[in-house]
């Protein structure tokens, strides 16, 4: 029998550094977790112990946060070179930039292979990014090989911005080919790498014959064995085994997200390549896990440009940014509207005399609003100022919604007002009105909306029967804070831009900003 | 292999009914919007109605807003077509499709099944 | 409603030749455009989403371009498998729409 032992991230997005608890930015450095400096301690630590080792990434170490925007993915090819990563799938997320932004900043830089089988190149493109990714690398590992096959979300059109000249293809379909010529080399124990989530990762492990181990991400899925670690629900199982068409039986794994844990896998193979055994779970890069020196100081180095970024000024505001949980939470809040309305100037595009605009409207948790700003620091506002507001490196996305999933959307960010719960909604074209003297689910007795195919916007009621184009937080069109019905009834959703990259545009743009409370959001007399 | 196989298709009688149903696999069916389009013989192909993910949310065609009722069953992996007071202008081949993630145009396509509105 | 406008109606081209077929929305609809091939007798197949990406396993001869109202579809070399009749759809906005089509047959 053969023993190779897999580390594996996924979903990192751009957290070089340690992080609080819940990956934002770490305040406590005594409680923080994750980031490179700590991971390479680990897989040092595990290099050194084990004999046959890999060192696996399945996707999205792009975006996220100011060393994303800054370093646009050279930080990724860098400090996963420094790591000595010996392989990783592409990610959705890797598209972010265009194929420009994924080609010289990454797949020119890194010195280990990035894979995706399902990804073909077309046009002038294939020329150009021929040989810099690759459908699968055959690995030496020891005395073995080891072949791994990638893959990428069929939907990365949707969610990135891969362009024209790259195909998108069927994961199952693309991966079959690839593993049978691998087999045709020689290759016996084959590990499919991807990111397409944890149920196309079980559809793999079910359908692609000759795939031993599936390797995911994508879903951000938390799978262990035992008592948890930390705050992570596990979906199942680490490994989860899924018994494949031909009566084997696959482990799949994923390890959460933003390098909080490393996955660690057990593998053993008997001689044929056939899995024997499979035993692990995800290691909580806790502090008790003690920074890399070497890493940690590279990372300081890095991080001097991030600093000098991070304090320039984008504007000024001559008012206060109200975005305290007292506020944003409980009533409409300048900092909301703020927000809102730089969601709407992102999204402007008149192009059409009938329409000023294709879309007026905004809806965003209070919940999302972490901080407010002072104007008594000169009125400057800088990126780090934004970041305390906006932490979590969401997106503001474009859905449409029928009239009446607005209403219940509406209805729900009151349905236990008053407890300082984040669904309270903040909005922009919208003006509602709320009477709390209502039972729940039937509080909302007034809710207007701005025109769009109009040449002088104005509010008219909501009909429940149309379908309205509306900007939020991807956390919203997932159904993040109970908004449960805005996932289950959308009927189109587009990716949008970076939160923090919007508003601090618009800021740029507006060079001074005073945004007041000005009656979007109103209670009836009686109630409140 | 994505597939979409409909059923349910027939000859009624002008206002009679019929319901249309369309199994799918190969793919998360509780992931995607689903929807149905027609083409009437020798015409071009006609949006009729959409229905988001979860079922909560429909969207109609003004020709058959009131008399077609789209549903689904993710327990089953099947959409449905519930077509009342039929007239000969709804007589047409019903295709069943599957949208892209998010909405964005139909990728997939059942085979359609024939609807005759005749007395 | 969003008019979509096909033309022309219908083409005859030899084998290899270059074709172009174009659609016009009554209003922008950015790119959210989709072509669709339908042989008699049988259900459409998805050529191109987004106006211009081309869907899975079909071949690189087809290619979309355009954005807002002005849209084209193009096959570099007709083949004698490409006769068939073609439909331009936008979702940008419900209720989603079809253009005439156009049939493409060989000469």
């Known amino acids: 029998a053969w023993e190779l032992t897999i580390l594996h991230t996924n979903d990192v997005h751009s957290r070089l550094e340690q992080t609080s608890e819940d990956s934002s930015k770490c305040v406590n450095a005594s409680r923080c977790m994750g980031g490179v400096a700590r991971l390479f301690t680990k897989v040092q630590q595990i290099r050194r112990a084990e004999p046959n080792v890999l060192l696996l990434d399945a996707g999205d170490q792009y975006q996220g946060t100011i060393w994303f925007t800054v370093y646009k993915g050279a930080e990724v090819a860098h400090f996963m070179n420094a790591l000595r990563y010996d392989a990783m799938a592409l990610g959705n997320h890797e598209f972010d930039n265009g194929v420009e932004g994924l080609i010289e900043p990454l797949l020119k830089e890194a010195k280990f292979p990035i894979l995706s089988a399902n990804i073909k190149a077309k046009g002038p493109l294939a020329s150009q990014i021929s040989g810099l990714y690759l459908p699968y690398k055959v690995l030496p590992v020891g005395d073995e090989v080891v072949g791994i096959v990638g893959y990428t979300s069929k939907e990365t059109p949707f969610l990135s911005n891969p362009g024209t000249n790259l195909v998108f293809e069927d994961e199952i379909t693309a991966l079959q080919p690839e593993v049978d010529k691998l087999k045709t080399l020689n290759v016996n124990k084959i590990i499919a790498l991807g990111h397409s989530g944890f149920e196309m990762d079980k559809l793999i492990a079910q359908k692609v014959r000759g795939v031993d181990v599936v390797v995911g991400g994508h879903s951000n899925t938390f799978l262990y064995t035992g008592n948890p670690p930390s705050k992570e629900v596990p979906a199942g199982k680490y490994p989860f085994i899924v018994t494949s068409d031909d009566g084997r039986k696959v482990p799949v794994v994923q390890a959460y997200a933003f390098g909080k844990y490393l996955g660690y896998l057990k593998i053993e193979f008997d001689e044929r390549g056939n899995v024997i055994s499979s035993h692990g779970n995800p290691i909580l890069l806790n502090s008790s896990i003690p920074e890399d020196p070497s890493i940690k100081a590279d990372i300081n180095k890095w991080r001097i440009k991030l600093d000098n970024y991070s304090t320039q000024e984008l504007g000024k505001t001559i008012v206060y940014l109200d975005g305290s949980s007292q506020s944003c939470r409980f009533r409409e809040c300048n900092m909301g509207n703020l927000i809102c309305d730089a969601m709407i100037n992102n999204n402007l595009r008149h192009t059409d005399e009938m329409f000023w605009n294709h879309v007026s409207m905004c809806i965003l948790n209070g919940g999302g609003i972490r901080s407010p700003i002072d104007e008594r620091n000169n009125g400057t506002i800088t990126w780090e100022n934004l970041a305390a507001v906006l932490p979590f490196g969401g997106t503001f996305d474009l859905v449409q919604l029928k009239g009446s999933t607005l209403k219940k959307a509406f209805e729900h960010s009151v349905h236990r007002y008053g407890q300082s719960t984040g669904e309270f909604l903040q909005v922009g074209g919208i003006h509602v009105v709320y009477d709390l003297s209502r039972k729940p689910g039937d509080r909302v007795v007034k809710l207007d909306v701005l025109c769009t195919k109009c040449r002088v916007p104005s509010y008219d009621p909501l009909k429940m029967d149309e379908v309205y184009k509306v900007i939020l937080p991807n956390f919203l069109a997932n159904g993040g804070d109970g908004f449960q019905m805005i996932k289950d009834e959308l009927l189109r959703h587009d990716s949008g831009d970076q939160d923090i990259n919007v508003v601090s545009t618009y800021i740029s743009k507006m060079k001074v900003i005073y945004p007041a409370v000005e009656g979007r959001i109103k209670f009836s007399t009686g109630s409140h | 292999e994505v597939q979409l196989l409909e059923s349910g298709g027939g000859l009624v009688q002008p206002g009679g009914s019929l319901r249309l149903s369309c199994a799918a696999s190969?793919?998360?069916?509780?992931?995607?919007?689903m929807g149905w389009v027609r083409q009437a013989p020798g015409k071009g192909l006609e949006w009729v109605s959409s229905i988001s993910s979860s079922g909560g949310a429909t969207i109609y065609a003004d020709s058959v807003k009131g008399r077609f009722t789209i549903s689904r069953d993710n327990s089953k992996n099947t959409l449905y077509l519930q077509m009342n007071s039929l007239r000969a202008e709804d007589m047409a081949v019903y295709y069943c499709?599957?949208?892209?993630?998010?909405?964005?145009?139909?990728?997939?396509w059942g085979q359609g099944t024939t609807v005759t509105v005749s007395s | 409603d969003i008019q979509m406008t096909q033309s022309p109606s219908s083409l005859s081209a030899s084998v290899g030749d270059r074709v172009t077929i174009t659609c016009r929305a009554s209003q922008d609809i950015s790119n959210y455009l989709a072509w669709f091939q339908q042989k008699p007798g049988k259900a459409p197949k998805s050529l191109i989403f987004a106006a211009s990406s081309l869907e899975s396993g079909v071949p690189s001869k087809f290619s979309g371009s355009g954005s807002g109202t002005d849209f084209t579809l193009t096959i570099s070399s007709l083949q004698p498998e490409d006769s068939a009749t073609y439909y331009c759809q936008q979702y940008n906005s419900y209720p989603l729409t079809f253009g005439g089509g156009t049939k493409v047959e060989i000469k």
């Open positions: 190969g793919f998360t069916f509780s992931n995607y919007i």
């Open positions: 499709a599957k949208d892209h993630l998010g909405g964005h145009g139909m990728d997939v």
